[in-house]
């Protein structure tokens, strides 16, 4: 407990060039009689920043009216901050003395430093797509911030990730710093609609972190499953064969039919549908003439997905004598 305390609540004040800085100072007593002055630095070489009684300080204004009775707020604002303004600022109470005022009590000081906001984080994924169950790396970069202390977090669909490495450069003193972080993410089959988020928190952002995102749809390849089936119904002397290509991503797909090893150009119809998880289904129908066919017809549905090696599924056509004899409007 003391007769008078000088309260400077902020140890560190981060300011931006060109902006206005507010330096807070309150006193707990108006006694003893005497002015409150602001200085930058300590000792005999300290620089007078503001004196309420005398001098011309064009960039400095007081937050409160110092002529108001019982005023205990001696905070000041300094406008148009430049790099030359950095340093530690002290509010100092003087008491009236004879013949001149005597320094009575100093505040603990507020260090003014230039702060710079980090740039918006940029998240980059892998150059090539990878299939589920494999691990992919994402990098996040942000630049131009000061001071050096910064926090970076990774999230996948809102869940925080722990497998990442972060570096802040340079390690020594600098006007501005950069951060780079690499996160390792295991892909799940349902990750087409997933997102990874890089979140950067810095003192200059006032509790409102910056976020960068990347869609896992850019990094994942979900290979299709194939199923070839013969439709029980016959249309005249033709049999309908279906090739169902399920759960693939991305959409890029080439489908070809082969009849006993010979590629066929004809394809009756096809449909593309999107699943809830963002993957696609492709259904292709192929009509086979059976009037002049032998019984050993082998149909192959071949799929080339996203530039990968082709996968295929074969079906040996079952054509009974009874089917061959039926008229075109009959139902088998």
């Amino acid at each position: 407990e003391e007769e008078l305390q000088m309260i400077q609540p902020e140890k560190l004040l981060l300011v931006t060039v060109g902006k206005t800085a507010t330096l807070h100072c309150t006193v707990t007593s108006l006694l003893p009689v005497g002015p409150v002055l602001w200085f930058r630095g300590v000792g005999p070489g300290r620089e007078l920043i503001y004196n309420q009684k005398e001098g011309h300080f064009p960039r400095v204004t007081t937050v409160s009216d110092l002529t108001k009775r019982n005023n205990m707020d001696f905070s000041i604002r300094i406008s148009s901050i430049t790099p030359a303004d950095v340093g530690t600022y002290y509010c100092v109470k003087f008491r009236k003395g004879s013949p001149e005022n005597v320094e009575f009590k100093s505040g603990p000081g507020t260090e003014m430093a230039l702060g710079a906001k980090p740039s918006a984080p940029v998240v980059l994924g892998p150059a090539a797509r990878t299939t589920p169950e494999h691990t992919v790396s994402f990098t996040c970069e942000s630049h131009g911030f000061s001071p050096r202390d910064i926090t970076l977090k990774w999230f996948k669909n809102g869940n925080e990730l722990s497998d990442f490495q972060t570096n802040v450069d340079p390690t020594g003193q600098s006007v501005a710093y950069s951060i780079r972080s690499t996160a390792r993410v295991v892909l799940d089959p349902w990750d087409v609609r997933s997102q990874v988020i890089c979140e950067v928190a810095h003192v200059t952002l006032q509790g409102d972190p910056l976020r960068g995102t990347a869609n896992l749809s850019e990094a994942i390849r979900v290979p299709p499953t194939l199923e070839v089936t013969q439709q029980p119904m016959r249309v005249g002397n033709q049999v309908n064969v279906t090739c169902q290509v399920r759960k693939f991503y991305p959409q890029s797909l080439q489908l070809t039919w082969s009849e006993n090893g010979n590629v066929c150009q004809r394809e009756t119809a096809s449909t593309l549908t999107e699943n809830k998880d963002g993957t696609y289904n492709w259904t292709s129908w192929f009509l086979v003439n059976i009037s002049d066919q032998r019984d050993d017809v082998v149909l192959t549905c071949q799929v080339k997905h996203d530039g990968q090696l082709a996968v295929s599924k074969r079906l040996a056509l079952e054509v009974t004598v009874h089917q061959k004899d039926q008229s075109s409007d009959a139902t088998p």
Epitope: E2, E3, L31, P35, K53
Partner: antibody, heavy 114, light 111 residues
């Protein structure tokens, strides 16, 4: 709680030095100043001087040549010395805390007489 | 030195009435937006008790019947309503300039 207590000889011979002690409790002498004030019998109050927390002093110019205020922070004591006393220095002597004089001792009576 | 002149020198008031004491300074006691004038109550055989600081601020524990006003050179202590135990000497004091000085006192008696 805050307390101040004056002590010293009740009788001092003329031309001698009056020495009083103010023992304080409930606050620190490094954080607060202590005043000395006196009151001659049946008269008003007269400020003698103050010793601040940093041990600097300010005195009433009318008494400055004869007054010394000092302190021993470790013992929580403030001292008043008034030299070359005369009968006009007969008074109740008070010590009071700080510029606000918010706490006072009970006072000690000093008579200057041969 | 700043001379503080109190008036009246003595005052007799009935309980429930208002008592007004004035203190005039030979020069302004205002500095840095405040009036460095204080009021004390002293009863016989006791040390002064602070009532008002900085012209108008009530010390903690002091009844709201006591109030202070004024600035510059003219100050007033008001007791309203007066009670029997308010009988005492009242002093104004300035600590705007050295030497710090007290007024000559006003004796308040209860009728």
């Amino acid at each position: 709680q805050v307390q101040l207590q004056e002590s010293g000889p009740g009788l001092v011979k003329p031309s001698q030095t009056l020495s009083l002690t103010c023992t304080v409790s409930g606050f620190s002498l490094t954080g607060y100043g202590v005043n000395w004030i006196r009151q001659p019998p049946g008269k008003g109050l007269e400020w003698i001087g103050i010793i601040w927390g940093d041990a600097s002093t300010d005195y009433n110019a009318a008494l400055k040549s004869r007054v010394t205020i000092s302190k021993d922070t470790s013992k929580n004591q403030v001292f008043l010395k008034l030299s070359s006393v005369t009968a006009a220095d007969t008074a109740v002597y008070y010590c009071a805390r700080a510029g606000k004089m918010d706490y006072w001792g009970q006072g000690t009576t000093v008579t200057v007489s041969s | 030195d700043i001379v503080l002149t109190q008036s009246p020198a003595s005052l007799a008031v009935s309980p429930g009435q208002r008592a007004t004491i004035t203190c005039r300074a030979s020069e302004s006691v205002d500095s840095y937006g405040n009036s460095f004038m204080h009021w004390y109550q002293q009863k016989p055989g006791q040390p002064p008790k602070p009532l008002i600081y900085l012209a108008s601020n009530l010390e903690s524990g002091v009844p709201a019947r006591f109030s202070g006003s004024g600035s510059g050179t003219d100050f007033t202590l008001t007791i309203n309503p007066v009670e029997a135990n308010d009988a005492a000497n009242y002093y104004c004091q300035q600590n705007n300039e050295y030497p710090w000085t007290f007024g000559g006192g006003t004796k308040v008696e209860i009728k």
